[in-house]
Interface confidence: low
């Protein structure tokens, strides 16, 4: 225990605090009548060096002076920054069995004098806040260093505060606890920071400022917005501010946006009119304040106000399409489809659509409202019909969009030529075509329409379509396109009163089918065999089937089978073959082919024709 120095004393020259690179002499002296009993000459004083409570060196060889039995002086050099502990111990050499006895100890601190504090910055938060200054202390001193912040100003105003840095805390900011009021707006204040420790002292350069330089207004609060006459595009933003504020900055954006709209407002007095808001849009608003037009600092941004602008009546043109199906000789079913307006056009929650079907000459009108994006009606097959649709929200309805109902594929002369469908990547298909060769009226636009070729798709799923300008001959279709699914794609050419169409099948990605068609029956009629099959289940087709192959060979033959390749048609499920010998048993099977390859074979059927051979 070194704090009870009963046996002697330890002293340091020149001082227990020394600059980096200096040497020190440590003297260890025994008190009178202390030491090894009976044999003073056997007293041996040793000095041990500890860093972070760990013994790092025995300084036995660093003795520079020795009064045998009474005192020893050791020279220590190359001390590292921070604190080092030295302990003097007494070793009674005639008794090797006893450990050395602690005499006393001393701590030596190695450090540097403080550098002049720099970059002083002072702020007062709000008109009622207090002045606080911060600075850069420079290099670490490794010693306890006291800092004094002094402020002086008009009318003999002086004020100072102190703090210290050591190995546990850092002092680079002080709050003076005084408030500068706006009536001192033109006055100049000076602050200085002085640093002092055992190795020296230094002072900052004086830092001069005015009230306006350092006062940062509090951010505005109590933000709210009032929409004029429930307008969705105009609103008055209101807020509370400190009394001296002369300039505000407003920023606002739709919640899903990445860039702010910025507005500067002078002498707004807590109020500003915004005129370019989007109706029915979630917005975030924030405000910042400044006390002076040219000088001073902006406050932090206020807390966000988040609110949705009111609705306004929809604008824009609905994209309408339709399907016609004849029911019997005098009735047809019209199915109208339209795409939802985008949010900037809907400008609110669309409550319903107003749909009108009108026979132009007889002035027959069918009207209805629906919440869906499709509408089906049965109407007479005679007459010229036109349809219109408008979208309505709580504030009103959009202007109706009209479309003439024509026979979409009725005019062969308007059918586009050389329609092709190429897969571009996993989720789109490039459709190209050539214009009709001998159209007797101008093409006003093309419509590319597509739907998955799966059972019930016409009734279950609405079509997808794209409107294409009349001088474009291609479309990249991507909406609802999935890989390994075959789509029927129609290109319609529409004039004012007629329509022509061409059809093709296409897929965005394909594989060979999972299985082959299932032969259900083989029948013999007039010396020909009719093979009947069921189509491959839709999920197993894995793209557009280009053709089916029928294979056959004699039952026990090892020869290559013969085959017949049939162009795929959805509506076809049987095919004749006529090159089989009578009274010979054959094995037959089928496969299906996509652009990626051939399926495994379907089921095998045996058959023995009875008629005479061709």
């Amino acid at each position: 225990n070194i704090d009870v120095c009963k046996l002697g004393t330890v002293t340091v020259q020149p001082a227990p605090v020394i600059p980096l690179g200096s040497a020190a002499n440590i003297s260890c002296s025994l008190n009178p009548k202390q030491g090894c009993s009976h044999y003073p000459s056997s007293n041996e004083l040793i000095l041990l060096k500890f860093v972070n409570d760990v013994l790092v060196e025995n300084l036995h060889g660093k003795k520079v002076h020795d009064h045998t039995g009474h005192s020893s002086t050791f020279q220590v050099t190359n001390l590292s920054l921070g604190m080092t502990l030295f302990v003097c111990k007494l070793n009674c050499s005639n008794s090797q069995k006893k450990p050395p006895v602690p005499v006393c100890g001393v701590e030596i601190s190695v450090g540097v004098a403080p550098e002049p504090p720099q970059n002083i910055s002072c702020v007062q938060e709000g008109e009622n806040g207090t002045v606080a200054c911060s600075w850069n202390s420079g290099k670490v001193t490794y010693l306890k260093t006291n800092y004094t912040l002094q402020l002086s100003g008009p009318n003999n105003l002086t004020c100072q505060k102190q703090c210290f840095s050591d190995n546990r805390q850092n002092c680079n900011r002080l709050d003076l606890g005084i408030n500068l009021s706006p009536d001192l707006a033109e006055s100049r204040f000076i602050v200085r920071v002085t640093a002092i420790n055992d190795l020296g002292n230094s002072s900052s350069l004086p830092h001069t400022f005015t009230f306006l330089d350092i006062v940062i207004p509090l951010p505005p609060w109590d933000i709210r917005i009032n929409f004029l006459n429930a307008s969705g595009s105009r609103g008055t933003l209101q807020w509370e501010d400190e009394g001296q504020v002369v300039l505000n900055q407003l920023r606002y954006q739709p919640l899903n946006s990445t860039s702010w709209n910025m507005v500067n407002a002078t002498n707004a007095k807590g109020k500003y009119d915004l005129r370019d808001l989007r109706p029915f849009t979630e917005y975030e608003f924030q405000i910042s304040s400044k006390l002076h037009l040219s000088g001073g600092s902006w406050s932090n941004w206020s807390e966000s106000l988040r609110t949705r602008t009111p609705e306004e009546e929809p604008v824009g043109i609905l994209d309408i399409w339709y399907m016609k199906q004849d029911i019997d000789y005098d009735r047809q079913q019209i199915s109208l489809f339209w795409k939802s307006l985008n949010p900037s056009e809907a400008r609110g929650k669309i409550l319903h659509y107003q749909v009108t079907l009108q026979e132009v000459t007889k002035k027959t009108t069918l009207q209805n409202t629906t919440r869906h994006t499709s509408w089906t009606r049965v109407i007479p097959r005679t007459g010229a019909w036109t349809a219109s649709v408008s979208a309505a929200n709580s504030k009103g309805a959009s202007a109706p969009t009209h479309i003439n109902i024509v026979d979409l594929c009725g005019t062969g002369l308007l059918a586009p030529h050389q329609v092709s469908a190429k897969s571009e990547n996993m989720d789109n298909i490039l459709v190209t075509w050539q214009p009709p060769k001998k159209a007797d009226s101008a093409v006003r636009e093309y419509i590319v329409e597509w739907r998955a070729l799966q059972p019930g798709s016409i009734t279950k799923f609405p079509p997808h379509w794209l409107r294409i300008p009349p001088d474009n001959m291609s479309a990249l279709i991507s909406e609802n396109i999935k890989p390994y699914i075959c789509y029927e794609i129609r290109v319609h050419a529409l004039s004012e009163s007629q329509g022509g169409c061409s059809s093709i099948r296409g897929d965005s990605k394909h594989k060979a089918p999972v299985s082959g068609p299932h032969i259900t029956a083989i029948t013999e009629k007039k010396e020909r065999l009719f093979i009947s099959w069921t189509h491959i289940p839709f999920p197993e087709q894995r793209g557009c089937i280009l053709h089916y192959r029928i294979y056959w060979k004699e039952r026990d033959s090892t020869a290559q089978p013969e085959l017949c390749e049939i162009q795929y048609r959805r509506s076809q499920n049987s095919h004749p073959i006529s090159s089989l010998q009578p009274r010979v048993t054959y094995v037959l099977w089928m496969t299906a082919v996509t652009a990626a390859g051939e399926s495994p074979q379907g089921n095998e059927r045996e058959f023995c024709p009875q008629g005479k051979a061709n």
């Epitope: 595009s233 370019d276 989007r278 604008v315 824009g316 043109i317 609905l318 994209d319 307006l341 985008n342 900037s344 056009e345 959009s398 636009e445 409107r467 300008p469």
Partner: nanobody, 120 residues
Amino acid sequence: QVQLQESGGGLVQAGMSLRLSCAASGLTFSWYRMGWFRQAPGKEREFVAGWYGVLTQYRDSVKGRFTISRDDAKNTVYLQMNSLKPEDTAVYYCAASLGGNYRSYEYDYWGQGTQVTVSS
């Protein structure tokens, strides 16, 4: 009062580039679909390029050469025209619509036009 002001036209040689700008004022620009049309002497006005929200559309003859872009903060729509050809010579018009596609009658506001001449 709504105004659309085109700029950036001029006389260039074939294969060169031009960038047309159209500055809009008096309308809430971000709501509007913007389009570029052109009209050559003795011909009908024809659609060149359009920007509808996330969808851009081009006439076939300019695909890969022309690019439409817009800056809602500056209320401006641009048409970058590269690899210009003599057949691109026309007066180019900027137009704004609340819901139109490529049909000129669907556009509500039109600029005065800027002349682009491409010499061979």
